[in-house]
Amino acid sequence: AWELTILHTNDVHSRLEQTSEDSSKCVNASRCMGGVARLFTKVQQIRRAEPNVLLLDAGDQYQGTIWFTVYKGAEVAHFMNALRYDAMALGNHEFDNGVEGLIEPLLKEAKFPILSANIKAKGPLASQISGLYLPYKVLPVGDEVVGIVGYTSKETPFLSNPGTNLVFEDEITALQPEVDKLKTLNVNKIIALGHSGFEMDKLIAQKVRGVDVVVGGHSNTFLYTGNPPSKEVPAGKYPFIVTSDDGRKVPVVQAYAFGKYLGYLKIEFDERGNVISSHGNPILLNSSIPEDPSIKADINKWRIKLDNYSTQELGKTIVYLDGSSQSCRFRECNMGNLICDAMINNNLRHTDEMFWNHVSMCILNGGGIRSPIDERNNGTITWENLAAVLPFGGTFDLVQLKGSTLKKAFEHSVHRYGQSTGEFLQVGGIHVVYDLSRKPGDRVVKLDVLCTKCRVPSYDPLKMDEVYKVILPNFLANGGDGFQMIKDELLRHDSGDQDINVVSTYISKMKVIYPAVEGRIKFSTGSH
């Protein structure tokens, strides 16, 4: 028997520095977690102790903190090289700055293979990107070889900016011929490494003949065997075992997100490359693991540019940006409108001639808006200003919901109106009218939504049975502020871009902003 140790990360999202337990900015260092310096310590410890070790990343290193905003992926290549990753799969967020924003900082600079079997380049891009990412890579591990085959969510064109010259194929259809090819190359130990979410990971384990292990990402799935060491609740045991259609037991793993854990999976193969046994658990990278001093010094060196960036002007406002709780928790506020407009703008994807855009709606809990911005400071808006407005380090995500769920959400928005509570919704692409004289749960008297399948966008009444795409904070997607109906009833959830980054990009693009209060949210009494 031959033993392989797979160390894996996914959805690190720019958490190069250690973070607090909830993966936001580290405040009390003695209780902070993750970060590449701490990760390196643990990886090196395992590499020294065990003979056959692979360090893999399942995508979405890009996007999530000011590190990505400033360094645009150069930080990913630099620190992943320093940690000596063996392979990485492309995630949807790797395309956030377009194909060029992937090629130049990451693909050309990475010293490790970057993989995806289901992304096919066409047109002029095909020759430009040729060889910079691969469908698979055969890695030597001691005297054995291990094949790593990559995959990426086929939803990427709706979630990011891959452009028109990349085709995202069905994962299973694309993976099978590559795995077959590996078999003909005498490679009998094959890992599928990819970024399509836990459900697709399980399907790949079930359907792709010849895949021995699946290492996934995208859904931030936490798996654990035994008592979990922190706040994350396991979605299943680690590894999660899937019985393939040809009767094999295939371990599937994921390691939550944000570099908080290092996935640790030990696989025992027989001499024919069959998995005999698999066991392990994610390792919580808490403060009991010291940060590696040389990596930490490098982080501190790179940090300097970030501090300079946060005080630079992004754009100007010529109006007061009202982000006060007195406004945003009670009525339409122009800060809410600005943020929602930025959220929609960030999700403009013309992927179908029938649709002007794939999504038109935004909702945002008023309690998530934490500060106004005064225009009487020469109108200047900085990253620092935005960090005061959106201090929680969240993301603006894409969900699919039925109209009936949206109606419940808007009823929840005003079910205890008047107590300055955070669940009051700010909106974009939605016109809502409330009648507060009615009983809670029956206060939404009009709810019109902006069409997407139209050449001239206009507002139509919400249909209860229709499925709508909505952009909202991850906080709401996870049921925060009492929006349990969103968490329970959502049909799809894809994590999006860092909240501050979305708004800062929009302001930089617009240069001068003047959001108004324009009647998106209205109150009435009496009949309609």
Epitope: K111, P140, L185, N186
Partner: antibody, heavy 115, light 108 residues
Framework: QVQLLQSGAEVKKPGASVKVSCEAS????????ITWVRQAPGQGLEWMGW????????NYAQKFQDRVTMTTDTSTSTAYMEVRNLKSDDTAVYYC????????WGQGTLVTVSS | EIVLTQSPSSLSASVGDRVTISCQAS??????LNWYQQKPGKAPKLLIY???NLQTGVPSRFSGSGSGTDFTFTISSLQPEDIATYYC??????????FGQGTKVDIK
Amino acid sequence: QVQLLQSGAEVKKPGASVKVSCEASGYTFTNYGITWVRQAPGQGLEWMGWISTYNGNTNYAQKFQDRVTMTTDTSTSTAYMEVRNLKSDDTAVYYCARGWGFAHWGQGTLVTVSS
Amino acid sequence: EIVLTQSPSSLSASVGDRVTISCQASDKINNYLNWYQQKPGKAPKLLIYDASNLQTGVPSRFSGSGSGTDFTFTISSLQPEDIATYYCQQYNSYPYATFGQGTKVDIK
């Protein structure tokens, strides 16, 4: 333990062919490819090609593409390499090695091409 | 095809000396590099795999480092039995491989 046993030395005339064998033992033959490397007298090591023992798939170095054929016989766990149209500068020791890690080598087969 | 350039092509050193051999790749090969020792009339012996990992049973005076395009092989304290030719070999693109031209090491 892993062993690769190669056939004995050969003397050939220019234009002739030679077939070198490499018999594997101590492991499952079909689990690892076989690599062939040669070394001319006083010269360095030269990678010639690789064959999959799984299905006979071959990858040859450009230089040997049209003169070399690699084959396997899984029933006897043996790999073969044939070099055709021999020239005097094909005089070399020919080695087989297991897989891609090259931790296990045959003892070498000296092929002398002389008129 | 990736070309490996080894230097020096030969060297003489005294017993106990530190010996360093360099290997430069024409394109980046991550850490996919092996080092071999070959004594006259013998098959090559794998010393270092993946640029820096010592093969089982190989004395710890042998070490390797590097990544990307520049690699180094070191014998920390040369012993009489280390007289041999040393080769680097890259395996960036399975199952292809290429060797450096070799460095002959002898004792002064």
